[in-house]
């Protein structure tokens, strides 16, 4: 008799997770010398071990400490990227500028970016049918926990200038439920951190709107500014030029030294 | 050394035309946006005109309609069409390569400028 | 079009420090740059992106950028640095401040 299967609203776990997982660990730790120690192995059973046989609503991010000490890792405090929104011309842009980092150029995020999971309770399977969505299942979910433990501990590691790069495309400039508005800024330590300097990107070269005035940056100013670190606000005007470097990292007009 | 040199600057009369040149040398010409600055006699800056290495052209409004910038990168060459030309457009006129990031631009070189004057 | 001020003179003893500002509505969200312009020359770039100096501009050459004001610095001004000085952003169009004349007393 087929067991009876919890359905949730959102798509399942992605398919060939464990081997994309392990696969990714092995490609990250050859890529970054510093990292040559990490037991990939051992990397994958602690990942497993915070979500296999746990109801898939009731995931804590203790479950991840395990991950996470496996996963420690410094990056340059002051070379920080944070993004909203803009996940892609983020990564796009440390690519290029190599000595600032984001989330997802960590190992950790480059484990889980753009992927699924979750298991079930009781049993060691992986759900690959469904898996609990944010908004319409539950908040504690594999995925979601995850990323709000690692962007945490991100963003308390943070330190000087921090930046976030923002899509001044969408109607929510700052949206304070996205994982920037609702975990990372909180995270920020007023202690190490003096400011955070948003880079809003524009839509197009023809929109010379100060997007820096928007009224959802003067609600992230705000809570920036309540928390005692210091807020600045550049607009970007240039998604042309900011991909054509991208994509051209030698390119002699990017990097130019004068 | 990177150098930029115009020419084809003169007097005109109103409502008459003229076209600069600009000759690039010392840097991959086709790697770089380019642009038109001018000064009118005792006046401050005035960009004029852009074009970007695939070609998209920008103009200030003062000047939108009349002229018309191109470049032919196998000449390393930027040019500056001026019609309709009117007596507020008598400047010297700078041409100037646009460096940057990311994140911004600016003119890190500029030629040493060809004089234009519109009278009658 | 963001409108940038600055003011038509500044005049400053040699070896003191000259600070041009230029203004303009929440300048600060933009990125500045200074140019020097000598009687008869080009303009030459001295500062990028509110603060970073290209290379061969002398060290006593700073800037600064927020709220409505940036800011070149010339400290410990030579005779040499009297010039014009313009500073110039961007917001879809690229705009140049009127320009301040550095007389070096």
């Known amino acids: 008799v087929p067991r009876w299967r919890q359905q949730w609203s959102g798509p399942g776990t992605t398919k060939r997770f464990p081997e994309t997982v392990l696969a990714r660990c092995v490609k990250y730790t050859e890529i970054h010398p510093e990292m040559r120690h990490v037991d990939c192995q051992s990397v994958w059973d602690a990942f497993k071990g915070a979500f296999i046989s746990k109801h898939p609503c009731n995931i804590t991010e203790e479950d991840y400490q395990p991950l996470m000490k496996l996963g420690t890792q410094t990056v340059p405090c002051n070379k920080i990227l944070l993004w909203s929104r803009i996940k892609d011309l983020a990564h796009q842009f440390t690519q290029v500028q190599r000595d600032m980092f984001t989330l997802e150029d960590t190992l950790l995020g480059y484990l889980a970016d753009d992927l699924t999971w979750c298991g079930e309770f009781n049993t060691s399977k992986i759900n690959y049918q469904s898996c609990p969505d944010w908004r319409k299942d539950c908040s504690n979910n594999p995925v979601s926990v995850f990323w709000k433990t690692v962007s945490r501990r991100f963003a308390e590691a943070a330190c000087d200038v921090v930046h976030v790069m923002l899509n001044g495309s969408r109607s929510k400039i700052f949206d304070k439920n996205s994982t920037f508005g609702s975990v990372e800024v909180h995270n920020l330590q007023p202690e190490k951190v003096q400011t955070l300097e948003a880079w809003v990107i524009h839509g197009g070269r023809e929109d010379s709107r100060d997007l820096c005035q928007d009224p959802t940056i003067k609600e992230l100013e705000s809570i920036i500014s309540k928390r005692n670190i210091q807020f600045s606000c550049k607009n970007i005007y240039r998604p042309d030029k900011f991909l054509q470097c991208v994509k051209n990292p030698e390119d002699s007009s990017c990097t130019s030294e004068i | 050394q990177v150098q930029l040199v115009e020419s084809g600057g003169g007097l005109v009369q109103p409502g008459g035309s003229l076209r600069l040149s600009c000759a690039a040398s010392?840097?991959?010409?086709?790697?770089?946006?380019m642009n038109w600055v001018r000064q009118a006699p005792g006046k401050g800056l005035e960009w004029v005109s852009n074009?970007?290495?695939?070609?998209?052209?920008y103009y200030a409004d003062s000047v939108k309609g009349r002229f018309t910038i191109s470049r032919d990168n196998s000449k390393n060459t930027l040019y500056l069409q001026m019609n309709s030309l009117r007596a507020e457009d008598t400047a010297v006129y700078y041409c100037?390569?646009?460096?940057?990031?990311?994140?911004?631009?600016?003119?890190?070189?500029w030629g040493q400028g060809t004089l234009v004057t519109v009278s009658s | 079009d963001i409108e940038l001020t600055q003011p038509p003179s500044v005049s400053v003893a040699p070896g003191q420090t000259a600070r041009i500002s230029c203004s303009g509505d929440?300048?600060?969200?933009?990125?500045v740059s200074w140019y020097q312009q000598k009687p008869g020359q080009a303009p030459v770039l001295v500062i990028y992106?509110?603060?970073n100096r290209p290379s061969g501009i002398p060290e006593r050459f700073s800037g600064s950028n927020s709220g409505n004001t940036a800011t070149l610095t010339i400290s410990g001004t030579q005779a040499e640095d009297e010039a014009d000085y313009y500073c110039?952003?961007?917001?879809?169009?690229?705009?140049f401040g009127g320009g301040t004349k550095l007389t070096v007393l």
């Open positions: 110039q952003s961007y917001n879809g169009t690229y705009v």
């Open positions: 010392g840097f991959t010409f086709s790697s770089y946006a």
């Open positions: 100037a390569r646009e460096d940057g990031s990311y994140m911004t631009d600016y003119f890190a070189y």
């Open positions: 929440n300048i600060g969200h933009y990125y």
């Open positions: 992106s509110d603060s």
């Open positions: 074009i970007q290495r695939v070609g998209s052209t």
